[in-house]
C-alpha cells in the first residue's frame, strides 16, 4: 500500500486558448484531471487502474501552483493504492477549462480540454521527487511526482507491512526496509524474547523482561550460577542441585555430623588433650588432677585414695588428712605398729620381719596388693575394653564385659545377640526383642552370669570389741583386725595394753 504523489508547479497558457485553438472567455479557468494506470507501451484511453484525481480551478491561463500540503490543501495530489507497487506506471494529465462552477465531466462541453499529456516509465519507491516538464504547441506544464509507502508499509514495493509495537506480541520499531528493529533489551524474530541480565546463566536462568535473571529450580544467585544444596545441608556444598558434598571434618547426609569436634568446639578444659572419636564424638585425656567428660572438674586430693591400710581421707583447706585405723600411723597410714606375730597379711600373703621385728612386709599372692595384701589387684586401670565394654577383675586376670552387639577378649568384635555366646559360666542365652537374657547356673549371677556368688564371711559380724573384719577371698574366711587391748581370732580376749609409743 502506498501513494503516488503528483505536485503541479506551473502551467503556462499564454494565449489562453483551448486545445481546439479557440480562446477561453474571458480567460481559461484551469483545473486538472489526473489518471494513473498500469504501464502501457502506448498510453491509451481506458480505465485508470491505479486511480484518478481532479483538482479545483487552480488559476487562469498561466499560473504557478501553490504547495498546499502543509495547509491541508490538494497539492501535491494524492493517488493512493493498496497493492504492491509494480515499479512502472502510465500517467495522463489533462488541463480543462471550467466555464462555470460544475466541474463534472458530463457538465463540461467536449471542447473544454486545454491540453493533455501522457507519460509512462519506471518509478521506484522513494522520497525524492522526479521533476518533469511537458510542452505542447500552446501550453507547458511543469510538475514533479514520486511514490511513497503508506504508514506501516515498507520496502521497494511498499509490500512489507510493519507496525511498531511494545506489547506481549513484540517490542520493536520498523526499519526503512520494513525489517523489525528491536527495542533495547529485546531480541528474537519478532522481538518477543527479553535479553536477560548480562551474565545470566544460559541454562539455569531465564527472564520475562529485560535485565532480569530468574533462576530455574535448583539454582540461585544473581546470575543463577550457584546450585542450591540439599535442603538441610549444614556444612556442605554442591556442584549440581540438591547435592550435599561435605566440607572437611563433617559427615552424614546433611553434613551435620561433626567428625572434627575437637577443632570446631575445643571442648577439653584444663589443658586436656582432645581426640576425635567419630561423628560428633570426642575423648578428652585429662591432665593429672582433673576428671569429667571435658576434664572440667578437679579431683579432690582424697580422690586419689592416698590413705593406706584402711585409713580414711578427709579434705582440708590446705590439702588432706588421713585418719588411720588402729595399728597404723604416718602421713598416709603407711607405718604399722603390728609385727608378723599379729598375722597382718591377708588373702594368703606371707609375712617377712623387718628392722629386728619392729616392722614387717607382706608378700602378696598375684591377685592382691597393698601393704597388708588387703586390696584386690585392679587390672582395669588401663581401660582395655573397647566399644564401651566394662572391665572386671577376675582373680589374677581381668575380663571385659561387653555391651550388646560386641564380643572378643576386649569387646573389639561386633556380633549380634546370642551368636557371640555372651553368657558366662555356662549360662543359657535367650534372644529377646531388644537384646538378650542369660539364665545363670547355680553359683553365678549378673546380667551375663559373670558374678561368682561367694559367701561374705564378714556378713555375720564375727569380730568382737569393734574389731575390723576382712574377708579372705582365697578361702572365703574372715580375719579380725583387733583394736588396742584385745587379742584372739575374733578379738574376744582382753589383754594389757602395749607400752605407749613416742609418736
Amino acid at each position: 500500500s502506498g501513494v503516488f504523489q503528483l505536485q503541479l508547479q506551473e502551467f503556462i497558457n499564454e494565449r489562453g486558448v483551448l486545445a481546439s485553438g479557440r480562446p477561453c472567455e474571458p480567460g481559461c479557468r484551469t483545473f486538472f484531471r489526473v489518471c494513473l494506470k498500469h504501464f502501457q507501451a502506448v498510453v491509451s484511453p481506458g480505465p485508470c487502474t491505479f486511480g484518478t484525481v481532479s483538482t479545483p480551478v487552480l488559476g487562469t491561463n498561466s499560473f504557478a501552483v501553490r504547495d498546499d500540503s502543509s495547509g491541508g490543501g490538494r497539492n501535491p495530489l494524492q493517488l493512493p493504492f493498496n497493492f504492491t507497487w509494480p515499479g512502472t506506471f502510465s500517467l495522463i494529465i489533462e488541463a480543462w477549462h471550467a466555464p462555470g462552477d460544475d466541474l463534472r465531466p458530463e457538465a463540461l462541453p467536449p471542447d473544454a480540454l486545454i491540453s493533455k499529456i501522457a507519460i509512462q516509465g519506471s518509478l521506484a519507491v522513494g522520497q525524492n521527487w522526479l521533476l518533469d516538464e511537458q510542452t505542447s504547441t500552446l501550453t507547458r506544464l511543469r510538475y514533479s511526482y514520486r511514490v511513497i509507502c503508506s504508514d506501516n508499509y515498507y520496502g521497494d514495493n511498499c509490500s512489507r507491512l510493519c507496525k511498531k509495537r511494545n506489547d506481549h506480541f513484540g517490542h520493536y520499531v520498523c526499519q526503512p526496509d520494513g525489517n523489525l528493529s528491536c527495542l533495547p533489551g529485546w531480541t528474537g524474530e519478532y522481538c518477543q524474547q527479553p535479553i536477560c541480565l548480562s551474565g545470566c546463566h544460559e541454562q539455569n536462568g531465564y527472564c520475562s523482561k529485560p535485565a532480569e535473571c530468574l533462576c530455574r529450580p535448583g539454582w540461585q544467585g544473581r546470575l543463577c550460577n550457584e546450585c542450591i544444596p540439599h535442603n538441610g545441608c549444614r556444612h556442605g556444598t554442591c556442584s549440581t542441585p540438591w547435592q550435599c558434598t561435605c566440607d572437611e571434618g563433617w559427615g552424614g547426609l546433611f553434613c551435620d555430623q561433626d567428625l572434627n569436634y575437637c577443632t570446631h568446639h575445643s571442648p577439653c578444659k584444663n589443658g586436656a588433650t582432645c581426640s576425635n572419636s567419630g561423628q560428633r564424638s570426642y575423648t578428652c585425656t585429662c591432665r593429672p588432677g582433673y576428671t569429667g567428660v571435658d576434664c572440667e572438674l578437679e579431683l579432690s586430693e582424697c580422690d586419689s585414695n592416698p590413705c593406706r591400710n584402711g585409713g580414711s581421707c578427709k579434705d582440708q583447706e590446705d590439702g588432706y588428712h588421713c585418719l588411720c585405723p588402729p595399728g597404723y600411723y604416718g602421713l598416709h597410714c603407711e607405718h604399722s605398729t603390728l609385727s608378723c606375730a599379729d598375722s597382718p597379711c591377708f588373702n594368703g600373703g606371707s609375712c617377712r620381719e623387718r628392722n629386728q621385728g619392729a616392722n614387717y612386709a607382706c608378700e602378696c599372692p598375684p591377685n592382691f596388693t597393698g601393704s597388708n595384701c588387703e586390696k584386690k589387684v585392679d587390672r582395669c586401670t588401663s581401660n582395655p575394653c573397647a566399644n564401651g565394654g566394662q572391665c572386671l577383675n577376675r582373680g589374677p586376670s581381668r575380663m571385659c564385659r561387653c555391651r550388646p552387639g560386641f564380643t572378643g577378649t576386649y569387646c573389639e568384635l561386633h556380633v549380634s545377640d546370642c551368636a557371640r555366646n555372651p553368657c558366662a559360666h555356662g549360662g543359657t542365652c535367650h534372644d529377646l526383642e531388644n537384646g538378650l537374657m542369660c539364665t545363670c547356673p547355680a553359683g553365678f549371677s549378673g546380667r551375663r552370669c559373670e558374678v561368682r556368688t561367694s559367701i561374705d564371711a564378714c556378713a555375720s559380724s564375727p569380730c568382737f570389741n569393734r574389731a575390723t573384719c576382712y574377708t579372705d577371698l582365697s578361702t572365703d574366711t574372715f580375719v579380725c583386725n583387733c583394736p588396742y587391748g584385745f587379742v584372739g581370732s575374733r578379738c574376744e580376749f582382753p589383754v594389757g595394753l602395749p607400752p605407749s609409743f613416742p609418736w
Epitope: Y261, K269, R280, T283, V293, E296, S300, E317, G319
Partner: antibody, heavy 120, light 108 residues
Framework: QVQLQESGPGLVKPSQTLSLTCTVS??????????WSWIRQHPGKGLEWFGY???????YYNPSLKSRITISVDTSKNHFSLRLSSMTAADTAVYYC????????????WGQGTLVTVSS | ETTLTQSPGTLSLSPGERATLSCRAS???????LAWYQQKPGQAPRLLIY???SRATGIPDRLSGSGSGTDFTLTISRLEPEDCAVYYC?????????FGQGTKVEIK
C-alpha cells in the same frame, strides 16, 4: 525458653531399677555444649548430684553412685534418661533433671521434679 | 568429696533487714566455681548466683554473692516477704559436684 519435664513411675519396688526420662522443649539436647544432669533431693534434705550426659554421648557419674547409674540421651526424641539400679527405701526422693551451661556446672534450667517412692 | 557447710541453719529476720548467709568449703574452690540457689516449697531450685558473684538473669540487685577460696557469702540487702525460702550453695569445681545442706530464711 528452655523447659525440662521429668517423667517416670512414682512408685518402685525394692531391688528394681528406676527409669526416668527428661524431655526438653524450647531447645535441643543435641545443640550447644551443655551438660544434661540428674539431681535428687531426699524428703526435707539437701541436694545430691548423680552425673551428666553431653550431646556427644559422653557421660560422667558421681563416683559414690557410679556402679548403679546409667544416663543416656536420645536426640531424635529430644530427651535424656536416668537408670538407677538396686533401688532401696533410701532412694525415695524427688528426682530433678537440670541443664548446666558450657564448661561450668551451675544449673540454669531445672525440671519441676518427680517424686519417686521405693516401697514393696 | 568437697563438703559445703552452710550457716546458720535457720535465719529469722524482719522485712527490710539484711540477711547474710555463709557457705564454707572443706577445700579451696578454684576459679570461684560456686553457685547459690533459692528453693521454695514444692518447687525446683532456682539459680541466683554463679561464679561466686555473678547474678543470674532476672535476679534483683538486692541479692549479691561474694567470697573466694573456702568462704563464700550470699547477701540479701533488704529482706522482702517473697525471699522466704531455703538457700543452697553448690560447688562445681571438684568432682563430685556437691551442695550445702541449706539455710532456711524466715520472715518474723
Amino acid at each position: 525458653q528452655v523447659q525440662l519435664q521429668e517423667s517416670g513411675p512414682g512408685l518402685v519396688k525394692p531391688s528394681q531399677t528406676l527409669s526416668l526420662t527428661c524431655t526438653v522443649s524450647g531447645g535441643s539436647v543435641s545443640s550447644g555444649n551443655y551438660y544434661w544432669s540428674w539431681i535428687r533431693q531426699h524428703p526435707g534434705k539437701g541436694l545430691e548430684w548423680f552425673g551428666y550426659i553431653k550431646n556427644s554421648g559422653g557421660t560422667y557419674y558421681n563416683p559414690s553412685l557410679k556402679s548403679r547409674i546409667t544416663i543416656s540421651v536420645d536426640t531424635s526424641k529430644n530427651h535424656f534418661s536416668l537408670r538407677l539400679s538396686s533401688m532401696t527405701a533410701a532412694d525415695t526422693a524427688v528426682y530433678y533433671c537440670a541443664r548446666a551451661g558450657s564448661g561450668s556446672h551451675y544449673f540454669d534450667y531445672w525440671g519441676q521434679g518427680t517424686l519417686v517412692t521405693v516401697s514393696s | 568429696e568437697t563438703t559445703l557447710t552452710q550457716s546458720p541453719g535457720t535465719l529469722s529476720l524482719s522485712p527490710g533487714e539484711r540477711a547474710t548467709l555463709s557457705c564454707r568449703a572443706s577445700q579451696s574452690v578454684s576459679s570461684s566455681y560456686l553457685a547459690w540457689y533459692q528453693q521454695k516449697p514444692g518447687q525446683a531450685p532456682r539459680l541466683l548466683i554463679y561464679g561466686a558473684s555473678s547474678r543470674a538473669t532476672g535476679i534483683p540487685d538486692r541479692l549479691s554473692g561474694s567470697g573466694s577460696g573456702t568462704d563464700f557469702t550470699l547477701t540479701i540487702s533488704r529482706l522482702e516477704p517473697e525471699d522466704c525460702a531455703v538457700y543452697y550453695c553448690q560447688q562445681y569445681g571438684y568432682s563430685p559436684i556437691t551442695f550445702g545442706q541449706g539455710t532456711k530464711v524466715e520472715i518474723k
